[in-house]
C-alpha cells in the first residue's frame, strides 16, 4: 500500500506525460488525479513505467472504478493489463473485438495467462456464442486456444465458425472435441466439391463417423497415415481392406509401418488375412482362413 | 532470469566524479530499456536515468548536465557517468529493467557516498 502524502508542491501532474517515469510511488499516489489517467489513458503504455509504478496507476484506477474499469479506459491498459488479477477482469463487460485484440497483443507469443483466460471467457460469454471473427483472432494469437475448449463449450462453435479454423488449430484437441467439431465441419463445408471439401475436412476426421470414411474411401481422397492414424478406432474398425485401400491410395504401404500401433493394429485384427494379402505388403495378424468370427455383443444380446 | 550487477560505488567528496557500471549476465528483452535508480535511507526508489531500447536517453531533472548514462552492447553493460556529485546524490544505485511479462528486475545496489 502507497503512504498517503500530501503532493509536493510544483508535483500536480497536469497531464500524463513522461516526466512522470521519475515520480517515486507515493508522489506518483499523491499527484496523479485518477480522473485525468482514466482520460489519457491511452498515454500510458508510451511511457516507459517501471510495473512498480504501473501498480500505484492501478491503485488509482481501481480506487475510481470500484465496480469494474469501463471499456474506453480497458482498450488502452497496454502493460498495465498484466497486473491485473482474474478477480478484476471478471468485473469487465468488454464487447469490443478491437479491445480483446490491443489485450492479447500485449501477451502475444507466451502461453495463455488466467487473466487472458479470464478475459476470453468474459468476451465469449457477453456475445453468447464463438462467432467467426472471435475464432479468427483467438486462434491467430493462441493456435491452440479451440483444443482448450471443453466440448460443451465447443457445441456453441456455430458451423460458419469453423472456416476460420486451421489445421494446427486442431493439433492438441482430443476424440471428443473432434466429435463435436466434426459435424459442424462437415455442415461447413457440405456445398464444397469432392477434393475441395477433403482438403478443409482433413484436420476434423478425428470426429468422423464409420459411414463418413466409406463414403471419402468412393471419392479417390488419398488419405495421408498422420491423418488415418488420428482417426476414431471404432470408426475403423469396421471397414472392409478394399475400403481402406481405397481410401489411402497410395499411402497404403504406409500401414506395414503402423501395423503394431492403433488404429491399424485393432484394424488388421478384425481382417481376415486372405483380405490382407491382397494389399501385399506382409501385414499379419488377421483372422485365419476357415476361422469363424463371432459378434460377441451380439451373442450376449442373445443370451 | 539475467542477472544485474553494479560496480564503481565508492565515498567521494562533493564536486567528484563516478562511473557506475551495470553488467547483465546475457541478453534482457526489456519493455522499457535499462535505468539507473536511487534509494536514499527511508526514502522510496526514485529513477535517475534511463536509456531506451532505441538509444533515447532520459534524465530526473535533479541530475540533468550532470549525469550520463551510456551502454555498450558489445559487453552487455550500462553505465552511469557522475559528475559534479552533491550530498543529495548518496544513495543506494540500482540498474533495472522491466520485462515483457510483468516483472521488474533489479540488481543488488552499489553505495553512493558524497561527503566531505
Known amino acids: 500500500e502507497v503512504e498517503k502524502t500530501a503532493c509536493p508542491s510544483g508535483k500536480k501532474a497536469r497531464e500524463i506525460d513522461e516526466s512522470l517515469i521519475f515520480y517515486k510511488k507515493w508522489e506518483l499516489e499523491a499527484c496523479v488525479d485518477a480522473a485525468l489517467l482514466a482520460t489519457q489513458m491511452d498515454r500510458v503504455n508510451a511511457i516507459p513505467f517501471t510495473y512498480e509504478q504501473l501498480d500505484v496507476l492501478k491503485h488509482k484506477l481501481d480506487e475510481l472504478y470500484p465496480q469494474g474499469y469501463p471499456e474506453s479506459v480497458i482498450q488502452h491498459l497496454g502493460y498495465l493489463f498484466l497486473k491485473m488479477s482474474p478477480e478484476d477482469i471478471r468485473k469487465w463487460n468488454v464487447t469490443s473485438l478491437e479491445t480483446l485484440k490491443a489485450l492479447l497483443e500485449v501477451n502475444k507469443g507466451h502461453e495463455m495467462s488466467p487473466q487472458v483466460a479470464t478475459l476470453i471467457d468474459r468476451f465469449v460469454k457477453g456475445r453468447g456464442q464463438l462467432d467467426k471473427d472471435t475464432l479468427d483472432t483467438l486462434t491467430a494469437f493462441y493456435p491452440g486456444y479451440l483444443c482448450s475448449l471443453s466440448p460443451e463449450e465447443l457445441s456453441s462453435v456455430p458451423p460458419s465458425s469453423i472456416w476460420a479454423v486451421r489445421p494446427q488449430d486442431l493439433d492438441t484437441c482430443d476424440p471428443r472435441q473432434l466429435d463435436v467439431l466434426y459435424p459442424k465441419a462437415r455442415l461447413a463445408f457440405q456445398n464444397m466439391n469432392g477434393s475441395e471439401y477433403f482438403v478443409k475436412i482433413q484436420s476434423f476426421l478425428g470426429g468422423a463417423p464409420t459411414e463418413d470414411l466409406k463414403a471419402l474411401s468412393q471419392q479417390n481422397v488419398s488419405m495421408d497415415l498422420a491423418t488415418f492414424m488420428k482417426l476414431r478406432t471404432d470408426a475403423v474398425l469396421p471397414l472392409t481392406v478394399a475400403e481402406v485401400q481405397k481410401l489411402l491410395g497410395p499411402h497404403v504401404e504406409g500401414l506395414k509401418a503402423e501395423e503394431r500401433h492403433r488404429p491399424v493394429r485393432d484394424w488388421i485384427l478384425r481382417q481376415r488375412q486372405d483380405d490382407l494379402d491382397t494389399l501385399g505388403l506382409g501385414l499379419q495378424g488377421g483372422i485365419p482362413n476357415g476361422y469363424l468370427v463371432l459378434d460377441l455383443s451380439m451373442q450376449e444380446a442373445l443370451s | 532470469q539475467v542477472q544485474l550487477v553494479e560496480s564503481g560505488g565508492g565515498v567521494v567528496q562533493p564536486g567528484g566524479s563516478l562511473r557506475l557500471s551495470c553488467a547483465t549476465s546475457g541478453t534482457i528483452f526489456s519493455r522499457n530499456g535499462m535505468g539507473w535508480f536511487r534509494q536514499a535511507p527511508g526514502e522510496q526508489r526514485e529513477l535517475v536515468a534511463r536509456i531506451l531500447n532505441d538509444g533515447t536517453t532520459m534524465y530526473a531533472d535533479s541530475v540533468k548536465g550532470r549525469f550520463t548514462i551510456s551502454r555498450d552492447n558489445s559487453k552487455n553493460t550500462v553505465l552511469l557517468q557522475m559528475n559534479s556529485l552533491k550530498p543529495e546524490d548518496t544513495a543506494v544505485y540500482y540498474c533495472?529493467?522491466?520485462?515483457?511479462?510483468?516483472?521488474?528486475?533489479w540488481g543488488q545496489g552499489t553505495q553512493v557516498t558524497v561527503s566531505s
Open positions: 533495472g529493467y522491466s520485462d515483457y511479462r510483468g516483472t521488474d528486475y
